[in-house]
């Protein structure tokens, strides 16, 4: 019986909802990959619960996750990156729930960084550039980026532009004059790998110049 919960505890445990979700990050620390899982119900009592991944691993049967507050985490080089792994929530030796997951389909890229906006007076446009660590990676190199911008006063009125490069041009006439704008960017895998949007980059703020052309008109957003 060692390693098992008390019978009463297990009966209670089986009434709970142990649904969980996971995401992988490849080459997140040099050649190391990571896998992060968390329960969907924030009220689950995680005291005796562990996560284990088995299958689709290099020269080991299974790996145990480390618990970091509410999340469970593995950092390893031992993902085969093909086929499905069995990820289980366990109490001692008993599996409460398991999911078969292909780690290449739950990839969450790292957030873009170094977002900046430069105004070109002669061209009457704004050049948006940003960087991504994925340009240097072996695996998740091809990403789709989502650039979102809004006038600071428009709380939820974001305009989104999808692009595959790390450079975008915004025409001045498409923006309101003499306005403060907030812009941010995120990424998602776009070739071979599948998964989720990254976190947003830190926002960048820029001001559009006042109108000084003869017509005094600018196109609305």
């Amino acid at each position: 019986e060692s390693g098992y919960a008390q019978n009463g505890d297990l009966e209670d445990a089986e009434l709970d909802d142990y649904s969980f979700s996971c995401y992988s990050q490849l080459e997140v620390n040099g050649s190391q990959h990571s896998l992060t899982c968390a329960f969907e119900d924030p009220d689950v009592n995680i005291t005796n619960l562990e996560f284990e991944i088995c299958g689709a691993l290099v020269e080991v049967k299974c790996l145990n996750f480390r618990k970091l507050q509410e999340i469970y985490f593995i950092e390893t080089k031992k993902f085969l990156l093909i086929g499905k792994s069995n990820i289980c929530v366990k109490v001692g030796e008993k599996s409460l729930t398991c999911k078969k997951i292909d780690l290449t389909t739950i990839v969450k890229p790292e957030a873009p960084f170094d977002l900046s906006v430069v105004y070109r007076e002669g061209a009457n446009d704004f050049v948006v550039t940003f960087n991504t660590s994925h340009l240097q990676k072996k695996y998740v190199k091809v990403l789709m980026h989502d650039v979102a911008y809004r006038q600071e006063k428009d709380e939820n009125k974001w305009t989104h532009v999808n692009l595959s490069s790390t450079k975008l041009t915004l025409l001045q006439r498409k923006l309101q004059p003499a306005a403060m704008y907030e812009i941010k960017v995120r990424s998602i895998p776009d070739h071979y790998f599948k998964g989720f949007w990254s976190e947003w980059s830190p926002s960048y703020y820029f001001r559009t110049p006042e109108i000084n052309n003869s017509s005094g008109e600018m196109d609305p957003i």
Partner: antibody
Framework: QVQLVQSGAEVKKPGASVKVSCKAS????????MNWVRQAPGQGLEWMGL????????SYNQKFKGRVTLTRDTSISTAYMELSRLRSDDTAVYYC????????????WGQGTTVTVSS | EIVLTQSPATLSLSPGERATLSCSAS?????MHWYQQKPGQAPRPLIY???KLASGIPARFSGSGSGTDFTLTISSLEPEDFAVYYC????????FGGGTKVEIK
Amino acid sequence: QVQLVQSGAEVKKPGASVKVSCKASGYTFTGYTMNWVRQAPGQGLEWMGLINPYNGVTSYNQKFKGRVTLTRDTSISTAYMELSRLRSDDTAVYYCARGDGNYWYVDVWGQGTTVTVSS
Amino acid sequence: EIVLTQSPATLSLSPGERATLSCSASSSVTYMHWYQQKPGQAPRPLIYEISKLASGIPARFSGSGSGTDFTLTISSLEPEDFAVYYCQEWNYPYTFGGGTKVEIK
């Protein structure tokens, strides 16, 4: 149809190396693992290792680690198994076999390559 | 490393009879697969993940079991079923059992 065609029989001396090829056709080569399994005369099956053709990542049976090297050439959809420092007990039929990564079983096998190690 | 022990080593039966082949693991296994091999041929998959029939395999073959004990059943032997059968664990190092030979009585 899905097919794995292996190179022909080999006769080697003890201490030598052998390299067996396995040409895949009829499916996306990089979408499945390639396993290598051997069978000594009158004996059972022994898993040697596998390669993920997409990225070249390998996983070896500890029994063969250091003696077996798995590689692939995705441009010609071919996997290779090289076994070094051959001994007489390496005499066997060597199979390449496609691995279904959804269920981790071997669903398509090559015809086998007989390797004889004899002085 | 898990050891898979198949029993019996040889099973002597007549066509039409029921064959029950056993595979016992030295510690718990999540999934088990079964293969058939005829003399001079490569193995072919029969059952994967304990009980799922591989492509083209007739319904007289079935698999069951959990934990450490798994069974392959052939409900009514046909002449082409006389062969050697191997079980294999789903996870590294993908160990095979020693095999059970089903021969004509």
